[in-house]
C-alpha cells in the first residue's frame, strides 16, 4: 500500500506519458489522477512502467472501479493484466473478442494461467456459447483448450464452431470429450462428399459408434492405424474382419504390430480364427474353429 502524500509542486500529471516512469511510487500515487489514467489507458501499454509502478497503477484503478473495470480499460491493460488475480477478473464483464485477443496476446507463449482461465470462463459465459470466432481465437492461443473443457461445457459448442477445430486441438481429448464432440462434427460436416468428409471427421472418430464405423468401411476411406487405435473399443468389437479390412484398406497390415494393444487385442479375441487367417497377417488369439459363441449380454436382455 502506497502512503498518501501530497504531490510535489509542478509534478501533477496532465497526461499519461513516458516522463512518469521516473516518478517514485509515492509520486505516481499522489500525482496521477485515476480518472486521467482510465481515460488514457491506451497509452499505458505503450509506456514501459516499472514492476513497482504497475502495482501503483493497478491500485489506482481498483480504487476508481471497486466493482470491476469497464471494458474500455480492460482492453488496454497490457502487462497490467498479469498483475490481476482471478478474483479481480471475476468482477469483469468482457464481451468483445478484440478485448479477449488483446489480453491473450499478453500471455502468449505461456501455459494457460488461472487468470486466463477465469477470463475465458467469464467471456464464454457472457456469450452463452462457444461460437466459432471465439473457438478460433482460443485454439489459436491454446491448442489444447478444447480438451480442457468438461463434457458438460463442450455440450454448449454449436456444430458450426467445429469448423474451427484443427486435428492438433484434439490431441489431449479423452473418449468422454470425443463422445460429445463427434455428433457435432458429424452434423457440421454432413454435406461434404466421402473423401472430404473423412478428412474432416477423422480427428473426431474416437467418439464414433459402431454403425458409423461400418458405414465408413463401405467408403474406401483407408483409415490409418493411428486413427484406428484411438477408436472406442466398444465400437470396434462388433466389426467383422471384412469390415475392418475395408476400413483400413492398405493399412490393414499394421494390425500385426498392434495385436497386443487395445482395441486390436480385444477385437481379435472376438473374431473367428479362420476369419483372421484370411488377412494373411498371422494374427493369433481368435475363436478356434468349431466353437460356439454365446452373446451373454443378448441373453440377459431377453430374460
Amino acid at each position: 500500500e502506497v502512503e498518501k502524500t501530497a504531490c510535489p509542486s509542478g509534478k501533477k500529471a496532465r497526461e499519461i506519458d513516458e516522463s512518469l516512469i521516473f516518478y517514485k511510487k509515492w509520486e505516481l500515487e499522489a500525482c496521477v489522477d485515476a480518472a486521467l489514467l482510465a481515460t488514457q489507458m491506451d497509452r499505458v501499454n505503450a509506456i514501459p512502467f516499472t514492476y513497482e509502478q504497475l502495482d501503483v497503477l493497478k491500485h489506482k484503478l481498483d480504487e476508481l472501479y471497486p466493482q470491476g473495470y469497464p471494458e474500455s480499460v480492460i482492453q488496454h491493460l497490457g502487462y497490467l493484466f498479469l498483475k490481476m488475480s482471478p478474483e479481480d477478473i471475476r468482477k469483469w464483464n468482457v464481451t468483445s473478442l478484440e478485448t479477449l485477443k488483446a489480453l491473450l496476446e499478453v500471455n502468449k507463449g505461456h501455459e494457460m494461467s488461472p487468470q486466463v482461465a477465469t477470463l475465458i470462463d467469464r467471456f464464454v459465459k457472457g456469450r452463452g456459447q462457444l461460437d466459432k470466432d471465439t473457438l478460433d481465437t482460443l485454439t489459436a492461443f491454446y491448442p489444447g483448450y478444447l480438451c480442457s473443457l468438461s463434457p458438460e461445457e463442450l455440450s454448449s459448442v454449436p456444430p458450426s464452431s467445429i469448423w474451427a477445430v484443427r486435428p492438433q486441438d484434439l490431441d489431449t481429448c479423452d473418449p468422454r470429450q470425443l463422445d460429445v464432440l463427434y455428433p457435432k462434427a458429424r452434423l457440421a460436416f454432413q454435406n461434404m462428399n466421402g473423401s472430404e468428409y473423412f478428412v474432416k471427421i477423422q480427428s473426431f472418430l474416437g467418439g464414433a459408434p459402431t454403425e458409423d464405423l461400418k458405414a465408413l468401411s463401405q467408403q474406401n476411406v483407408s483409415m490409418d492405424l493411428a486413427t484406428f487405435m484411438k477408436l472406442r473399443t466398444d465400437a470396434v468389437l462388433p466389426l467383422t474382419v471384412a469390415e475392418v479390412q475395408k476400413l483400413l484398406g492398405p493399412h490393414v497390415e499394421g494390425l500385426k504390430a498392434e495385436e497386443r494393444h487395445r482395441p486390436v487385442r480385444d477385437w481379435i479375441l472376438r473374431q473367428r480364427q479362420d476369419d483372421l487367417d484370411t488377412l494373411g497377417l498371422g494374427l493369433q488369439g481368435g475363436i478356434p474353429n468349431g466353437y460356439l459363441v454365446l452373446d451373454l449380454s443378448m441373453q440377459e436382455a431377453l430374460s
Epitope: 514501459p48 516499472t50 514492476y51 504497475l54 502487462y79 498479469l82 498483475k83 499478453v106 500471455n107 505461456h110 501455459e111 494457460m112 494461467s113 488461472p114 487468470q115 486466463v116
Partner: nanobody, 119 residues
Framework: EVQLVESGGGLVQPGGSLRLSCAAS????????MYWYRQAPGKERELVAF???????NVRDSVKGRFTISRDNSKNTLYLQMNSLRAEDTAVYYC?????????????WGQGTLVTVSS
C-alpha cells in the same frame, strides 16, 4: 528465471567515466524492457535509465547528456555509459527487469555494483 550480474563499478574521480555492464542469463527471450536503478547511501532507490526491447531509451533529467543506456541483444548484456561523473552519482547501481511467466510478472534484480565518485 532470469539471472542478472552487474560489473564495471569502482572508484573514479569527478569528471571521470565508467561503463557498467549487466549480463543476463536464463529466460532472456522473455525480457522486454531493462532498467538501471541506483541507491545512494541513506536515500531511496531511484530509476536512472531504461531501454525497451525495440531499443527506445530514456534517462532521468539529472543525468541527461551524461549517461547513456544501451543493450547488446546478441550478448544479452545491458550497459550504462557514465560520463562527467559527479559526487552525487555515488551509489550502488542495480540492473532490473521483469518477465511474464505462469500468468504473472516476475521481477529480477542483480546484486548491484558500487560506484564511488570522489577525489
Amino acid at each position: 528465471e532470469v539471472q542478472l550480474v552487474e560489473s564495471g563499478g569502482g572508484l573514479v574521480q569527478p569528471g571521470g567515466s565508467l561503463r557498467l555492464s549487466c549480463a543476463a542469463s536464463g529466460s532472456t527471450s522473455s525480457i522486454n524492457t531493462m532498467y538501471w536503478y541506483r541507491q545512494a547511501p541513506g536515500k531511496e532507490r531511484e530509476l536512472v535509465a531504461f531501454i525497451s526491447s525495440g531499443g527506445s531509451t530514456n534517462v532521468r533529467d539529472s543525468v541527461k547528456g551524461r549517461f547513456t543506456i544501451s543493450r547488446d541483444n546478441s550478448k544479452n548484456t545491458l550497459y550504462l555509459q557514465m560520463n562527467s561523473l559527479r559526487a552525487e552519482d555515488t551509489a550502488v547501481y542495480y540492473c532490473n527487469t521483469y518477465i511474464p511467466y505462469g500468468g504473472t510478472l516476475h521481477d529480477f534484480w542483480g546484486q548491484g555494483t558500487l560506484v564511488t565518485v570522489s577525489s
